[in-house]
């Protein structure tokens, strides 16, 4: 809609809105210790932080229920924080018949908006 | 990932975990009776409901995102619940040469999972 | 182009059901509402109700409330209208428009005669 | 309910000549976003209604431009330039203000 627009600036201050962060996780935290080899640490990108009214709004549906929230907070919920592209990462993982390479193109996120 | 399963039984009681919800919103619950001409009140289905521990998880980030939240859950947001899917809707508005039809493929949400 | 092709014509007794089926032939209801009107032998056209999407909840005159029901399936791009309690007076052409809201009914089905006879 | 009254209830008409029909609503069809709710539709022997004019004077896709819609509030008139031998049929109004949806009693256009 032209009549509602998505801003990028953060009301509630620095570092307090929906961004990508970066979380250091191993294996053993996934529980993946025992079929990924290898990296054996990862480096997750995550969508973290608040979806204040109309912060980096995903598409239509996310400005709408911003503006629903507002007038039912009880009923609607605020958009939240989630990725709105991914990179891809290759896993080596133990198989049946041995050893493979996988890429996974929905494990770290890339970017963030308010969906 | 092979080794966490997304699930589909909520944990915690009927209507409690992510699923659509209808809402009838009127164009001046929207902010879009200036603009919009019919049809003069909508039906926006939306996500709501909580994202317990691998209740329909998006993909594998939200998988992980889950799995992580549970260790670090000041740090680590859960998955929240949003759309998977969007059902079209045509709206008659105004324009500056009079009237126009417009289909918006991303106002009223279809599905929903845990992101 | 997209067209409403409805389900053909009935005979009814009196107090059964009817369920008339509309399908867009040539693509989906792309987000249009469905509207539900019907025409009495040599009378004027009277609206019933509709339904927009997400096809979730739909919207009757008073005249029908409690005896018309009106549901879409996105799946199969097909709208229906139940008219339970028939009488002799329901003897008419009924038809399905795709329109924005209740506005704009550009597309109209072929029409589904039903006769309510004893 | 909105009530719909049309006039006349039959209009003979000589192709090539003008023709005016009359539709008034027991209340305004006019909305606070300065529309009037007001369809016109035509339905030809032996077929489904067409769409011909919404909004009161917007003129639907692909319908020749010798149909044009006028009027605000309770009265609205729709006319036909040169009327031509495919012309004939009813015509009804309809109002989209409020539900339920009402549509005039119609006006029967034939070929003098």
């Known amino acids: 809609s032209a009549h509602l627009h998505p801003r990028d600036s953060c009301p509630l201050g620095p570092g307090r809105c929906c961004h990508l962060e970066t979380v250091q996780a191993t294996l053993e935290d996934l529980g993946w210790s025992d079929w990924v080899l290898s990296p054996r640490q990862l480096q997750l990108s995550m969508c973290v932080g608040e979806c204040p009214h109309l912060y980096r709004s995903a598409n239509t549906h996310a400005l709408i229920k911003a503006r629903l929230h507002g007038l039912q907070p009880d009923r609607v919920p605020a958009p939240c924080c989630v990725p709105s592209s991914y990179t891809p990462v290759v896993l080596m993982h133990r198989t049946d018949s041995g050893v493979s390479l996988q890429t996974y193109d929905d494990l770290v996120a890339q970017g963030c908006h308010c969906a | 990932s092979a080794h966490l399963h997304p699930r589909d039984s909520c944990p915690l009681g009927p209507g409690r975990c992510c699923h659509l919800e209808t809402v009838q919103a009127t164009l001046e619950d929207l902010g879009w009776s200036d603009w919009v001409l019919s049809p003069r009140q909508l039906q926006l289905s939306m996500c709501v409901g909580e994202c317990p521990h691998l209740y329909r998880s998006a993909n594998t980030h939200a998988l992980i995102k889950a799995r992580l939240h549970g260790l670090q859950p000041d740090r680590v947001p859960a998955p929240c619940c949003v759309p998977s899917s969007y059902t079209p809707v045509v709206l008659m508005h105004r324009t500056d040469s009079g009237v126009s039809l417009q289909t918006y493929d991303d106002l009223v949400a279809q599905g929903c999972h845990c992101a | 182009q997209v067209q409403l092709v409805q389900s053909g014509a009935e005979v009814k007794k009196p107090g059964s059901s009817v369920k008339v089926s509309c399908k867009a032939s040539g693509g989906t209801f792309q987000g249009y509402a469905i509207s539900w009107a019907r025409q009495a032998p040599g009378q004027g056209l009277e609206w019933m109700g509709g339904i927009i999407p997400p096809y979730a909840t739909a919207n009757y005159a008073q005249k029908f409330q409690g005896r018309v029901t009106i549901t879409a399936d996105e799946s199969t791009s097909t709208a229906y209208m139940e008219l339970s309690s028939l009488r002799s007076e329901d003897t008419a052409v009924y038809y399905c428009?795709?329109?924005?809201?209740?506005?704009?009914?550009?597309?109209w089905g072929q029409g589904t005669m039903v006769t309510v006879s004893s | 309910d909105i009530v719909m009254t049309q006039s006349p209830l039959s209009l003979p008409v000589t192709p090539g000549e003008p023709a005016s029909i009359s539709c008034r609503s027991s209340?305004?069809?006019?909305?606070?976003?300065?529309?009037?709710?007001l369809d016109w539709y035509l339905q030809k022997p032996g077929q489904s209604p067409q769409l011909l004019i919404y909004l009161g004077s917007n003129r639907a896709s692909g319908v020749p431009d010798r149909f044009s819609g006028s009027g605000s509030g309770t009265d609205f008139t729709l006319k036909i330039s040169r009327v031509e031998a495919e012309d004939v049929g009813v015509y009804y109004c309809?109002?989209?203000?409020?539900?339920?949806?009402?549509f005039g009693g119609g006006t029967k256009v034939e070929i003098k």
């Open positions: 428009a795709r329109g924005v809201g209740e506005l704009h009914l550009d597309v």
């Open positions: 309809m109002q989209a203000l409020q539900t339920p949806i009402t």
């Open positions: 209340q305004s069809l006019l909305h606070s976003n300065g529309y009037n709710y």
